[in-house]
């Protein structure tokens, strides 16, 4: 039994790191491997995971960590049986993966702004809670090509939109995601998304405006 | 062997800051969350703000939020903890504590004392 | 903020005979990680705190067995099973999932 691609890991820097590699053949994971992980204290349990398949080769272990600090360090030993597999270490501040902003609402009784809210997906005393920047994706239901990314580069969880820049009496769908600069972090997957209508009007008088300047033409 | 030594006792008057140190050997204060637990004469002990010494990034009681700050040198191996606009109310022992993921090593406290 | 609720403040033991004291939280003390980061401490005269019990049931490295830790949700419980002289002092129950982080206002043991 011989590793292919050897284990590879990001954390979401609160207690969950999840590590996946490739075995040299078909493998019954969850039968055949253990994945040890150890981080390096004075006072530390010794954890064990137990993969699941990713594939007929592939593997994924989700690695439970708790009260993670800018300096951890996790030792790792992949075993088969008494057999060592692999050996190597994780550093979860330098792979950090974030969670997913959380409750994504739209509303659009704003006057003639959408306000998209969400929350962050992190309590107050982690490090990630004030570091997270986000952006949201628009799209249009109907016409795939009618899609916008949108920015959040402030660290308030909202994003407010002229409902004008969208196309009228059209449904839209909104997703958001989020990254941590600071640690140089990957981008969160993307929240589940949200579905509006779209119900904004033209002001009569532009929309005559328009129609009268066509009228010239 | 795990300690942590803190500064000595204080006597300041009101108005006044006070700065108390608390140096650690025995392991790396980079790999765990320092915090300060405050007590007063003949009551309990209160949680008041901790510190991850690798990024510096600190959170407090709101209680303690403007009236304590705290640092770590990770050079040194040493966390402090800073009071100011001392009133008679701050006389207190105050505690430095590692906690990785609990309160297993304590400091031995300094006595801070605000009097006119 | 969280509060914990520490039942008796006080307690008179004879030595051999057992202890219990309960704390109650405000709230649920679950931690988002799904751990309860529910702990117990002894402050013995004229020293610092020592750990006793993590995550509710766990004893700390050196603590004697006669310490033991149990509860959920809201409600916990610090048992000695034979209390002996050098367990007097002061015991807090604690809460480490939410900030703030709060302490209960202890419970005092004496021997008879």
């Known amino acids: 039994m011989k590793v292919l691609q050897e284990p590879t890991c990001v954390s979401d820097y609160i207690s969950l790191s999840t590590c996946e590699w490739k075995m040299g053949g078909p493998t019954n994971c969850s039968a055949e491997l253990r994945l040890v992980y150890q981080l390096v204290f004075l006072i530390s349990e010794t954890n064990m995971c137990v993969p699941e398949n990713n594939g007929a080769a592939g593997c994924v272990c989700h690695l439970f960590m708790e009260d993670m600090v800018g300096a951890d360090n996790y030792t790792l030993d992949l075993w088969a049986g008494q057999q060592l597999l692999w050996k190597g270490s994780f550093k979860p501040s330098e792979h950090v993966k974030p969670k997913a902003p959380e409750n994504l609402t739209v509303y659009t009784n704003v006057s003639e702004t959408l306000l998209l809210t969400w929350s962050n997906p992190y309590p107050p005393d982690n490090y990630l809670y004030e570091k997270l920047t986000y952006a949201v994706n628009i799209w249009n239901e109907n016409d795939p090509t009618d899609s916008r990314i949108y920015d959040v580069t402030y660290q308030e969880p909202t994003l407010r939109i002229a409902a004008s820049t969208l196309k009228s009496g059209v449904s839209y769908r909104a997703r958001v995601r989020a990254w941590a600069q600071s640690y140089n972090s990957t981008w969160s997957e993307w929240s589940p998304s949200t579905k509006w209508y779209n119900a904004y009007k033209e002001p009569f008088e532009k929309h005559h405006h328009h129609h009268h300047h066509h009228h010239h033409h | 062997e795990v300690q942590l030594v803190q500064s000595g006792a204080e006597v300041k008057k009101p108005g006044a800051t006070v700065k108390i140190s608390c140096k650690v050997s025995?392991?790396?204060?980079?790999?765990?969350?320092m915090h300060w637990v405050k007590q007063a004469p003949g009551k309990g002990l209160e949680w008041m703000g901790r510190i991850d010494p690798t990024n510096g990034y600190t959170i407090y009681a709101s209680k303690f939020q403007g009236k304590a700050t705290i640092t770590a040198d990770t050079s040194s191996n040493t966390a402090y903890m800073e009071l100011s606009s001392l009133r008679s109310e701050d006389t207190a022992v105050y505690h430095c504590v590692s906690r990785r993921p609990w309160f297993a090593y304590w400091g031995q406290g300094t006595l801070v004392t605000v009097s006119s | 903020d969280i509060v914990m609720t520490q039942t008796p403040l006080s307690l008179s033991v004879t030595p051999g005979q057992p202890a219990s004291i309960s704390c109650r939280s405000s709230?649920?003390?679950?931690?988002?990680?799904?751990?309860?980061?529910l702990e117990w401490y002894l402050q013995k005269p004229g020293q610092s705190p020592q750990l006793l019990i993590y995550?509710?049931?766990n004893r700390f490295s050196g603590v004697p067995d006669r310490f033991s830790g149990s509860g959920s949700g809201t409600d916990f419980t610090l048992k000695i099973s034979r209390v002996e002289a050098e367990d007097v002092g002061v015991y807090y129950c604690?809460?480490?999932?939410?900030?703030?982080?709060?302490f209960g206002q202890g419970t005092k043991l004496e021997i008879k």
């Open positions: 995550k509710v049931t």
């Open positions: 604690f809460q480490g999932s939410h900030v703030p982080y709060t």
């Open positions: 709230q649920s003390i679950v931690h988002s990680n799904g751990n309860t980061y």
């Open positions: 025995g392991f790396n204060i980079k790999d765990t969350y």
